[in-house]
């Protein structure tokens, strides 16, 4: 299931990097959450529970991210113009039932006043 | 199709070890939280163990804890209950089952371990 | 330790009529909306099958004739209908902490 471009500011600009942020709805207990650029993954975050209910969180791919109750963040540093792009959060919600998958997403602008080491 | 084929079971003495092993098939193994249920002749059913993803996380029953360790090899599709210091009340036919996500949704058929001497 | 018992023990029930298995919690299951509570039937020389979970959705495949309900501590499976092929022994589980504890199993037969 494809929802299109993010009905949210999905990027967040500062020192140089880019906050991207991907929402989940409250509902959701167990997901798998991609960061895609282009058709390429590059951050994955996976929130699993046990037979005990203990949580697990994994990341194949090493990103710097965040999570909370209802999205995950994912941070890019030391952006430059090869970053700009469409990028897109793929959840994939194992709980609650059924299985479901959600692509939303945007274009990421690069402008010179959010890049790291502007040359003067 | 999802498919658990449990091994290692038989007669062991008080004390002594034994490692089980269940081979799974069918589906990405990285992807679940396995886990060893087991059931004593003629009783119900008692949870014993579980391992996350990746090996990071584990849990056990109160009464193997100290004595039975739990492990996986996802590149082999691969759990494993290591059983040592084993008693009579641990004999039982023993289940590796896949946690899915919110019940068990896969068993194996089990593998029978008998202590006695 | 959350304490699972089911009740009855053992029931002889003619083909047709409903059955009724109860599970009690010692402390509730009810957690965000979701009661932690699954049932599973296992029959005579196989392992456990999973019937519901989170105490009223049925699995994919199993049969609309059973169906789970109740709330917090006390749950309930029905099977509107035995068909011989229910005899079995029919096991509550929770999964709201660790350790995740059974029921001690009910044991369906047809009378």
């Known amino acids: 299931e494809i929802n299109g471009s993010a009905n949210y500011e999905m990027f967040i600009f500062h020192n140089g990097g880019v906050q991207i942020l991907c929402k989940y709805p409250d509902i959701v207990q167990q997901f798998k959450m991609q960061l895609l650029k282009g058709g390429q993954i590059l951050c994955d975050l996976t929130k699993t529970k046990g037979s005990g209910n203990t949580v697990s969180i994994k990341s194949l791919k090493f990103c710097h991210s965040q999570l909370s109750n209802n999205s995950v963040s994912f941070f890019l540093y030391n952006l430059d113009h090869s970053h700009a792009n469409y990028y897109f959060c793929n959840l994939s919600i194992f709980d609650p039932p059924p299985f479901k998958v959600t692509l939303t997403g945007g274009y990421l602008h690069i402008y010179e006043s959010q890049l790291c080491c502007q040359l003067k | 199709e999802v498919q658990l084929v449990e091994s290692g079971g038989g007669l062991v003495q008080p004390g002594g070890s034994l490692r089980l092993s269940c081979a799974a098939s069918g589906f990405t193994f990285s992807d679940y939280w396995m886990d060893w249920v087991r059931q004593a002749p003629g009783k119900g059913l008692e949870w014993v163990s579980n391992i996350d993803h990746d090996g990071n996380i584990i849990n056990f029953a109160p009464s193997v804890k100290g004595r039975f360790t739990i492990s996986r090899d996802n590149a082999k599709n691969s759990l494993y209950l290591q059983m040592n210091s084993v008693r009579a009340e641990d004999t039982a036919v023993y289940y590796c089952a896949r946690w899915g996500h919110y019940a068990f949704d896969s068993w194996g058929q089990g593998t029978l371990v008998t202590v006695s001497s | 330790d959350i304490v699972m018992t089911q009740s009855p023990d053992s029931l002889a029930v003619s083909a047709g009529e409903r059955v009724t298995i109860n599970c009690k919690s010692s402390?509730?299951?009810?957690?965000?909306?979701?009661?932690?509570l699954i049932w599973y039937q296992q029959k005579p020389g196989q392992p456990p099958k999973l019937l519901i979970f989170y105490a009223s959705t049925r699995q994919t495949g199993v049969p609309d004739r059973f169906s789970g309900s109740g709330s917090g501590t006390d749950f309930t499976l029905t099977i509107s209908s035995l068909q011989a092929e229910d005899v079995a022994v029919y096991y509550c589980q929770h999964h709201y902490s660790s350790p995740p504890t059974f029921g001690q199993g009910t044991k369906l037969e047809i009378k």
């Open positions: 402390q509730s299951l009810l957690s965000s909306g979701y009661n932690y």
